[in-house]
């Protein structure tokens, strides 16, 4: 009679993570008597996957009933496959022995490859805000995919970026892989509404790439421009001075009026107007009682934006042309407003 052969008909099996892998194995004879075992890997370091004699295998089931006397089908199913299950599986026939069974014949092996989807890309930007014209770095990470081949692209508002570096780890063989990419983006004043997108394409995604996004509104700081102007006289001895704070982002802003270097009033930007590009405008005004001043007055609008060092703009108020009123000691009325209710 012909000697028993162990046949593993599939050289390789490709399974998606979470699915069930079927590893096929048949024997050509019932003789010699002895159990079948499944191993992952070969040699002394192999891992026992299934033992016909004993053991507990929560994820492994046999395709046929191995207790039947004439059974020659030793195929197994492995459920809930993960990338860690990848490897070459061998169906091995043992000959009954004493005290131990002896390995008799091994199949040629079936390579199990696991396709695992990458995790949703996570995009993170710099820890601190930056101003236009500065270059900032964004990182994109995705994990747990297999096989290793993967494509990553960066976009800013739909336009593909070219200044980025990508690494896939580990370099050698692994059950699953991670990708890490860093892109450099130059900020412009119009970037408050801009988005940076990291796009990952992988064989498991069937042409529908995963995207991670970051809003540049979290990254950019657009410093304000200041303009101080003197309005026409409202009353005989009062001058209206306005400070226009334009094109700033984010909204966090504090304004201080100084008269000849002395603090007159401090206020926080509240009712701002938003520009189409996402930046803000705000206006503050000061009524100056010129009759309280004998000399010219230097008015300064000082703005602290988003915790940055203050910027200021000054205006010299000529008072020599105004008649001096005696008995008045109020230099400025403590009233401020936004631009909607000035007049």
């Amino acid at each position: 009679e012909e000697e028993l052969q162990v046949i593993q008909p599939d050289k390789s099996v490709l399974v998606a993570a979470g699915e069930t892998a079927t590893l096929r194995c048949t024997a050509t004879s019932l003789i010699p008597v002895g159990p079948i075992q499944w191993f992952r890997g070969a040699g002394p370091g192999r891992e026992l996957i299934y033992n016909q004699k004993e053991g507990h295998f929560p994820r492994v089931t046999t395709v046929s009933d191995l207790t039947k006397r004439n059974n020659m089908d030793f195929s197994i199913r492995i459920g809930n496959i993960t990338p860690a299950d990848a490897g070459t599986y061998y169906c091995v026939k043992f000959r009954k022995g004493s005290p131990d069974d002896v390995e008799f014949k091994s199949g040629a092996g079936t390579e199990l490859s696991v396709r695992a989807k990458p995790s949703a890309p996570v995009v993170s930007g710099p820890a601190a805000r930056a101003t236009p014209q500065h270059t900032v770095s964004f990182t994109c990470e995705s994990h747990g995919f297999s096989p290793r081949d993967i494509t990553l692209k960066w976009f800013k508002n739909g336009n593909e970026l070219s200044d980025f570096q990508t690494n896939v780890d580990p370099v050698g063989e692994s059950v699953s892989y991670s990708i890490h990419s860093t892109a450099k983006v130059v900020l412009t004043r119009e970037d408050v509404h801009s988005q940076v997108i990291c796009e990952v394409a992988h064989v498991t995604l069937q042409g529908d790439p995963l995207r991670g996004t970051a809003n540049l509104s979290e990254t950019i700081r657009v410093p304000p421009t200041l303009e101080v102007t003197q309005q026409p006289v409202r009353a005989e001895n009062q001058v209206n001075v306005t400070c226009q704070v334009r094109k700033f982002y984010p909204q966090r802003l504090q304004l201080t009026w100084l008269e000849n270097g002395n603090v007159s009033r401090t206020e926080t930007a509240s009712t701002v107007t938003e520009n189409k590009d996402g930046t803000y405008n705000w206006m503050s005004w000061l009524l100056v009682n010129v009759s309280a001043h004998r000399d010219d007055v230097k008015l300064t609008c000082q703005v602290e934006h988003d915790g940055q060092p203050a910027v200021s703009k000054s205006h010299d108020l000529k008072v020599s042309a105004h008649p001096k009123e005696q008995g008045s000691n109020t230099a400025a009325e403590n009233t401020g407003s936004n631009e909607r209710n000035i007049y």
Epitope: G45, R46, E47, L48, I49, N51, G55, I78, D85
Partner: nanobody
Framework: QVQLQESGGGVVQAGDSLRLSCVAS????????MGWFRQAPGKEREFVAG????????YYADSMKGRFTISRDNAKNLVYLQMNSLKPEDTAVYYC?????????????????WGQGTQVTVSS
């Protein structure tokens, strides 16, 4: 070389549960089959449970089947033994063992490395 350190032992009442942990260091944990053994006073060391390197196959001594569960966390280099419905006869020093090769309940023969053990006492 592999270093093994057991923890989680203690004194419990009959019927209680206990979870033993064993942390391994010094070699790639995912290349090691792991097992638990115990030795009661005046008795030989006996096999309790074993688990293959990926965790796909597990083995239990007949007297512990259904009460004890072995598991592992390859990311943390840990192997666990969850012991439920403990009996006074489960009182023993429990040892963690690591094997470079593993053939089911043949593990006592194959174990290359052993921990120092953790005492479990079950009082009635």
């Amino acid at each position: 070389q592999v270093q093994l350190q057991e923890s989680g032992g203690g004194v419990v009442q009959a019927g209680d549960s206990l979870r033993l942990s064993c942390v391994a260091s010094g070699r790639a944990f995912s290349s090691l089959d792991m097992g638990w053994f115990r030795q009661a006073p005046g008795k030989e060391r006996e096999f309790v449970a074993g688990i293959s390197r990926s965790g796909i196959s597990q083995y239990y001594a007949d007297s512990m089947k259904g009460r004890f569960t072995i598991s592992r966390d390859n990311a943390k280099n840990l192997v666990y033994l969850q012991m439920n419905s403990l009996k006074p006869e489960d009182t023993a020093v429990y040892y963690c063992a690591a094997a470079l090769t593993f053939r089911g309940s043949d593990l006592p023969r194959d174990s290359n490395y052993w921990g120092q053990g953790t005492q479990v006492t079950v009082s009635s």
